[in-house]
Interface confidence: low
């Protein structure tokens, strides 16, 4: 069974699926429609690089410029360097600014929803 | 609603090269990428390549790469489409498509048809 | 690249009859897969999409199912107006391809 005959089984079940298995199907040329992609867990998809979701969704990806103001592809989005979501040529805007580090204070962001930037 | 307006007929001599446009209107224009779609008379369908919806990235049929150029001009939605060095083989109807989010080509414009003849 | 096989050209049918069209693709594409119908002189109209979601506004005869490689769309009591060109689309991977189409005729 290749990736996307698989995708096609577990498709009603990834609402729950963990990073994990996120970062697994993106390797399966499993072509994620946008609808499924929605519908994932906020804080599965964060993890997630520009380069996994590129591939995790194939084609589809250019579904996040009509979705960047939704959840969980907004909150996807601040989370990358804004040079990393440039290389999507899609136009998606609010990524970290380039210089800025990005230091994972799991308080922090729990308390703001966006992680902690240090300027350049 | 979303309308895709595309530019007359073209009637070029071989080694020409002719530049159709598309103009959207009914919707952000950069918000959706711009697809173009070659039919030959009687013919199926092929995909030549979109271009993104800020118009600073294409992606092509790599059959299309030497022949086919697009661009966009944001201040008057209007994609373009250059159309090279013609041949017979280059006369078809050029369709752009707009993709949906969820569907590839919900929205097309009319075509334009493009003769190439000596 | 990816090949999408329609295997009929034509198709006779009558006005009430149930027909189907199928597609075959040279490897899986899951369920990314759209049928579109042309009139001569017009654009192609999304019937279908991710294999089997009727697109807003299409008239429930038109039915598309098949996962993986082989895909059917079914016209059920076919009407005079559906007397077209069917193609299937994957978008499963770049390029995106296209059928060569099946031309549905009156018997």
């Known amino acids: 069974m290749n990736g996307s005959e698989y995708f096609v089984k577990i498709q009603s079940f990834l609402g729950g699926a963990p990073t994990e298995d996120l970062k697994a199907l993106s390797q399966q040329n499993v072509s994620m429609d946008l609808a499924t992609f929605m519908k994932l867990r906020t804080d599965a998809v964060l993890p997630l690089t520009v380069a996994e979701v590129q591939k995790l969704l194939g084609p589809h990806v250019e579904g996040l410029k009509a979705e960047e103001r939704h959840r969980p592809v907004r909150d996807w989005i601040l989370r990358q360097r804004q040079d990393d979501l440039d290389t999507l040529g899609l136009g998606l805007q609010g990524g970290i600014p380039n210089g800025y580090l990005v230091l994972d204070l799991s308080m922090q962001e729990a308390l703001s929803g966006t992680p902690c930037l240090l300027g350049p | 609603q979303v309308q895709l307006q595309q530019s007359g007929a073209e009637l070029a001599r071989p080694g020409a090269s002719v530049k159709m446009s598309c103009k959207a209107s009914?919707?952000?224009?950069?918000?959706?990428?711009m697809h173009w779609v070659k039919q030959r008379p009687g013919q199926g369908l092929e995909w030549i390549g979109y271009?993104?919806?800020?118009?600073?990235?294409?992606k092509y049929n790599q059959k299309f790469k030497d022949k086919a150029t697009l661009t966009t001009d944001k201040s008057s939605n209007t994609a373009f489409m250059q159309l090279s060095s013609l041949t017979s083989e280059d006369s078809a109807v050029y369709y752009c498509?707009?993709?949906?989010?969820?569907?590839?080509?919900?929205?097309w414009g009319q075509g334009t048809l493009v003769t190439v003849s000596a | 690249d990816i090949v999408m096989t329609q295997s009929q050209k034509f198709m006779s049918t009558s006005v009430g009859d149930r027909v189907t069209v199928t597609c075959k693709a040279s490897?899986?594409?899951?369920?990314?897969v759209a049928w579109y119908q042309q009139k001569p002189g017009q654009s192609p109209k999304v019937l279908i999409y991710?294999?089997?979601y009727r697109y807003s506004g299409v008239p429930y005869r038109f039915a598309g199912g098949g996962s993986g490689t082989d895909f059917t769309l079914t016209i059920t009591n076919v009407q005079s107006e559906d007397l077209a060109e069917y193609f299937c689309?994957?978008?499963?991977?770049?390029?995106?391809?296209f059928g060569a189409g099946t031309k549905l005729e009156l018997k």
């Open positions: 498509a707009r993709w949906n989010g969820t569907v590839w080509f919900a929205y």
């Open positions: 009914g919707y952000t224009f950069t918000t959706y990428t």
């Open positions: 271009i993104s919806p800020t118009g600073d990235f294409t």
């Open positions: 490897q899986a594409l899951g369920t990314n």
């Open positions: 991710s294999a089997s």
């Open positions: 689309q994957q978008y499963n991977n770049y390029p995106l391809t």
